[in-house]
């Protein structure tokens, strides 16, 4: 039964003599192992004997007999799966049908394979894509229908005969699917290779050829363009003419369209393959190209810079930068279209030469105020010397120069004047947009820089103002020199140290704690009259007449000042004491009299005595003594003492009479 | 902060040349102009030459046929050659920075040369 | 070149006094003139620049003035240290000193 014998394996085999043939091949015998195998070359069945008849190349049986052929063929095979074969060597004569006899227990069957062995190693076939466009990345494929383990063969690829450098990927199938080994090369082609011959050659292990393919490369590429000029170098002066020429080195396919262009753009009706420019502008200069197209696309020529040479044009600068702030650095800049490209400078500021300026740029490493102007500048090359350009203006920004504050009053001031001061300037840059005082006060600034200081004062000492643009510069201090009359006059005493008792020698001194001018005159005065004209009033031996209110006065040129009048107290113990009787020294008995023990005294008396004509003290100690009623026997000589602090004081006597009332008289 | 340091020979013969280097430190010489100056002993302050600072020079006239300024930028080194030194070129010499409308504010000691056999 | 004539040569002055030195250029400088201290044995300082601008640090008693081809130079209330030689310079046109005035003490 056919349908239980299944084989795979490739229908058809190629090797050349001496070479060898590997036969992959798998089968299935579904009623169980294999018993027989016969390898016949070129089978033919006898239906007589209804066995095959051909040259048996292997015989596998059970009595084991092996022919001699048997050493070049092997089976490779096993019982139930595998039928691998191989012929090493292969000959020519083994050309034609290969058939695999197999015969289990119960069944039979023929396998036939193709083998085609040639004379010679038969060559390799490239295969191409079916386009090849320059700079794309294509693969070439070399492909041989063999393979066999017993013979290494390899595939080497050449362009115009020289092995290529790229690196070839080679692989190699043994497979009951399919035998060969196949070669594949990645490659970028240009246009340069269009034409050439890609060679895909065989060789036997030892790198000795066996056959080989070849193959002409059609690459398709945009057309390929040299362009010549006259002038060779394309330096050329206005004026002159220039022709360019386009030619076409390559193409493939053939071109359709040719243009020029001139910086990337197209130039108008100039389709031939000369360019004749006449009479050249220095607009011209550029570079120059010409474009050809085929239906790849366009090809371009390589540029040609065209230089159209010319003196320079009038300059212009650029100053880095303005406004500059005194003590920066600053850059200038000439700038001039010219060609070839200037040589030489000349620089100017405002109009005069700066010497020793000869370069494209001016650096200056500090700008200071009088480097502001205008700068210009000349340039120069072989062509000559182009014009000066209206220039460039420097501004240069600094802070207000000497600044000075100025007193307008006529001098010197007095306190209590209205003093205007002004804040001035040398220069500024930008313009003084606001001033400072120092130290600051309630004042008015009746207009800018100006300050009134209305009824000053005599401690007004120095004043400094600041002028301000986007800086501040201070004035140093000007003294305003504040005249005025003495200060603070008071009397002190400088003796004694203690309290005056009459008798010391005392002095009095007039203070003042300023006076400006410091020239002064001293006054003493008590009760409107003058005492002295020093500054000390000096007593030698003070009575209690001198006490009393006192004022010194001291005056410069600018006016007088007078002190607090100051009291001037002696201290003396009771004097000048006497008794005083009331209503007189004669009194009628019954009635009342006083005495009263009048005293001066400082401090006043503290402590009274009274005495009779026995001098003996009597027992009342106040300023009055008060007999009621008074009798005849209180007749006599009184006196009385005082007492203070510094001593005490005794008066006369004073003799007091008592006499009879009339009812007495009466009575007697 | 800017510094001068001049190197001479101290001593040179008559009729011989004189080479001084002057190397800065502090400022570029693409940006400031270096005057060469001397003082004799017992006379006055003498301008010899300037390399300004695109390398351009310029001499004082009574010693254009004997002076030579050179520099090299990268080094910060400026060169003052003279020839035929007499005894009256006996002298201490100054490199001196300046710029553009700004005089010269840095001078270093000088080195002295003295012209003898 | 330029021709700076510097004058007086040599001035005797008192402490506490002024004293005044004059540069006359052959042609206009343009304010373009410096004053220089020098003292022996230093390198020579700059006082002045363009005509009357104080170098920073340099006391206000040193001042100068002057334009086109006349310039002065003064210091007022002499002190022992100004005791040197000065020196005009003009950058106007290359360079050029003066020939230098001795400062002494009477």
């Known amino acids: 039964d056919s349908s239980k014998w299944v084989f795979e394996h490739p229908e058809t085999l190629y090797a050349w003599e001496g070479a060898c043939v590997w036969i992959p091949c798998t089968y299935r015998a579904l009623d169980g192992d294999l018993e027989s195998f016969i390898l016949f070359h070129n089978p033919e069945y006898n239906k007589n004997t209804s066995k095959f008849d051909g040259t048996r190349l292997y015989e596998s049986t059970k009595d084991g007999k092996v022919p001699s052929e048997q050493k070049r063929v092997q089976f490779l095979g096993d019982k139930n799966k595998n039928c691998t074969l191989s012929i090493h060597p292969v000959h020519l004569n083994d050309s034609g049908q290969l058939g695999l006899r197999m015969e289990s227990k119960t069944e039979k069957w023929m396998e036939r394979i193709h083998l085609n062995v040639s004379e010679r190693p038969f060559p390799p076939h490239i295969q191409l894509p079916p386009e090849i466009q320059e700079s794309q990345e294509v693969t070439l494929t070399c492909l041989l229908n063999f393979s066999c383990y017993g013979y290494p063969i390899q595939l080497q690829w050449l362009l115009e005969g020289v092995p290529m450098r790229q690196a070839a990927v080679t692989s190699t199938s043994l497979t009951i699917k399919s035998v060969f080994t196949r070669s594949e090369l990645k490659f970028s082609p240009q246009w340069s290779h269009h034409g050439k011959i890609v060679t895909c050659q065989l060789q036997d292990a030892d790198g000795k050829f066996l056959s080989n393919d070849t193959v002409q490369l059609n690459v398709k590429h945009t057309p390929k363009l040299e362009i010549k000029v006259t002038p060779s170098d394309a330096i050329v002066r206005e004026g002159d003419s220039v022709t360019m020429t386009c030619e076409v080195s390559s193409s493939n396919p053939e071109y359709t369209t040719v243009s020029w262009l001139k910086d990337g753009t197209s130039l108008k009706k100039q389709n031939t393959f000369t360019l004749n420019l006449r009479e050249v502008t220095k607009d011209q200069s550029g570079k120059y190209c010409c474009q050809v197209s085929n239906d790849v696309g366009p090809g371009r020529s390589e540029e040609v810079f065209l230089q159209v040479q010319y003196a320079p044009e009038p300059s212009t600068v650029q100053i880095l930068h303005s406004p500059a702030v005194e003590g920066s650095q600053v850059e200038f800049l000439c700038m001039s279209l010219a060609n070839p490209l200037p040589t030489n400078y000349t620089w100017y500021h405002n109009g005069k030469e700066m010497q020793g300026r000869t370069e494209e740029k001016v650096h200056i490493p500090k700008i200071l105020p009088w480097h502001a102007g205008t700068y210009s500048c000349v340039a120069e090359n072989i062509l000559g010397t182009g014009q000066r350009g209206p220039g460039a203006e420097l501004d240069v920004q600094y802070p207000p120069k000497k600044v000075t504050t100025v007193i307008q009053n006529p001098m010197p001031i007095r306190e209590g004047d209205t003093v205007t001061l002004s804040c001035n300037y040398n220069s500024s840059n930008p313009s003084v947009t606001r001033y400072e005082w120092k130290p600051h006060g309630a004042w008015e600034e009746p207009s800018l820089g100006v300050l009134k200081i209305q009824n000053v004062g005599w401690d007004n000492t120095t004043i400094a103002c600041a002028a301000c643009n986007s800086w501040c510069s201070w004035a140093s201090p000007v003294a305003l020199n504040v005249q005025y009359a003495p200060r603070d006059v008071r009397v002190r005493k400088i003796k004694p140290l203690s309290e005056i008792h009459s008798g010391n020698s005392v002095s009095l001194q007039c203070d003042f704690s300023s006076s400006h001018p410091k020239e002064v005159q001293f006054f003493w005065e008590k009760n409107g009259r003058l005492l002295g004209k020093e500054s000390q009033l000096n007593f030698d031996s003070i009575s209690p007449e001198d006490a009393g209110s006192y004022s010194c006065w001291v005056n410069n040129s600018i006016g007088q000042t007078a002190s607090k009048a100051w009291t001037l107290e002696v201290l003396y113990a009771p004097r000048r004491l006497r008794v005083s009787m009331s209503p007189g020294d004669q009194v009628m008995e019954g009635k009342s009299a006083t005495l009263t023990c009048e005293s001066d005294a400082n401090p006043p008396v503290s402590h009274y005595t009274w005495f009779d004509w026995n001098n003996q003290s009597l027992p009342y100690h106040s300023q009055k003594l008060r007999l009621e009623p008074v009798k005849v026997q209180h007749s006599g000589a009184y006196w009385c003492q005082g007492t203070n602090s510094v001593g005490k004081g005794r008066s006369p006597l004073s003799t007091l009479t008592v006499y009879y009332s009339p009812e007495t008289i009466g009575r007697r | 902060e800017v510094q001068l340091q001049e190197s001479g020979p101290g001593l040179v013969a008559p009729s011989q040349s004189l080479s001084i280097t002057c190397t800065v430190s502090g400022f570029s010489l693409t940006s400031y102009d270096i005057s060469w100056i001397r003082q004799p002993p017992g006379k006055g302050l003498e301008w010899l030459g300037v390399i300004w600072t695109g390398g351009g020079t310029n001499y004082n006239s009574a010693f254009m046929s004997r002076l030579s300024i050179s520099k090299d930028n990268s080094k910060s080194q400026v060169f003052l050659k003279m020839n035929s030194l007499q005894t009256d070129d006996t002298a201490i010499y100054y490199c001196v920075p300046h710029y553009y409308g700004y005089a010269m504010d840095y001078w270093g000691q000088g080195t002295s040369v003295t012209v003898s056999s | 070149d330029i021709v700076l004539t510097q004058s007086p040569s040599s001035l005797s002055a008192s402490l506490g006094g002024k004293v005044t030195i004059t540069c006359k250029a052959s042609q206009d400088i343009n304010k373009y003139i410096a004053w220089y201290q020098h003292k022996p044995g230093k390198g020579p300082r700059l006082l002045i620049h363009y005509t009357s601008t104080l170098q920073p640090g340099i006391p206000s008693r040193f001042s100068g003035s002057g334009s086109g081809r006349d310039y002065s130079f003064s210091i007022s209330n002499l002190e022992p240290e100004d005791i040197a030689t000065y020196y005009c310079?003009?950058?106007?046109?290359?360079?050029?000193f003066g020939a230098g005035t001795k400062l002494e003490l009477k």
């Open positions: 310079l003009q950058y106007d046109n290359l360079l050029t």
